[in-house]
Amino acid sequence: GIAIPRNSGCPNSEDKNFPRTVMVNLNIHNRNTSTNPKRSSDYYNRSTSPWNLHRNEDPERYPSVIWEAKCRHLGCVKADGNVDYHMNSVPIQQEILVLRREPRHCPNSFRLEKILVSVGCTCVTPIVHHVA
């Protein structure tokens, strides 16, 4: 593996007293970057498996707003605009880490949580089911 340089002042994570809780600065470093994926590219419209973006809002989570993709079609769009059902549009899912308020409604206390989000759609060959 790659050796990561370690600051001699870092706490020993193998110590049984190593904290399970940490202080996190929620001021986003690159806040100027667009958080609405619609603005960053138009792949969602140009793709052979186009998708729509939906705002998923949860005040008990940080970040509270996540944009999720839903495929527009069961099939894939051909160059002529026709839908080809011999191919399938499927969501591309990504596991991400978010902070969940715990206990609920507490402004400054969070627990790390993994969630699965759909970030776009792609075109795949369908699973063929053979009829006996």
Partner: antibody
Amino acid sequence: QVQLVESGGGVVQPGRSLRLSCAASGFAFGSYTMHWVRQAPGKCLEWVTLISFDGRSKLYGDSVKGRFTISRDNSKNSLYLQMNSLRAEDTAVYYCARGSVRGEAAFDLWGQGTLVTVSS
Amino acid sequence: SYELTQPPSVSVSPGQTASITCSGDNLRTKYVSWYQQKPGQSPVLVIYQDTRRPSGIPERFSGSNSGNTATLTISGTQAMDEADYYCMTWDVDTTSMIFGCGTKLTVL
């Protein structure tokens, strides 16, 4: 006006064939994916099959695969369902339905339905 | 294969809010549409793409979809809303459209 009208239903013996038709009017038929949906008496809706705008791409529900064939004639604004090897469980009202231009997960126009009874 | 589960029946008093649920594994990742079917009539689309209402459908009909459940909400329910309601989505694994088995809405 914008409508779909099914025809061709009736009483047929098990193992025999029947062809249903659906006449479309009032909209650009050739621009829409079309579907057949059926409903057995007193039962749920069941999707049967679909055909793409140009007729090149088709999908079938497991219960009818290999027995039913969907087709269309855009020059006649017509949709068809050829049903072979009919079984008692195929008894139902058959609806033709138009797929929404915004995606398949919506049928925005339905016909009045035609009843198919499979009985000896 | 993918399944959509609906309660067989829901009862509501006139003027009250009716909520009809539709459950399926990770349903929020799929689009859901809702259909109203009155006795002896063809189904009518009332909600598509989870929340959108076709023209001609009253504003009292609304939809939502999160987690494993999509919900059709009818606010200020009227006697004319008494009908069977079906949810629908698609399943990529079987490349087919899937209907729930319907919920009978009774306006008391």
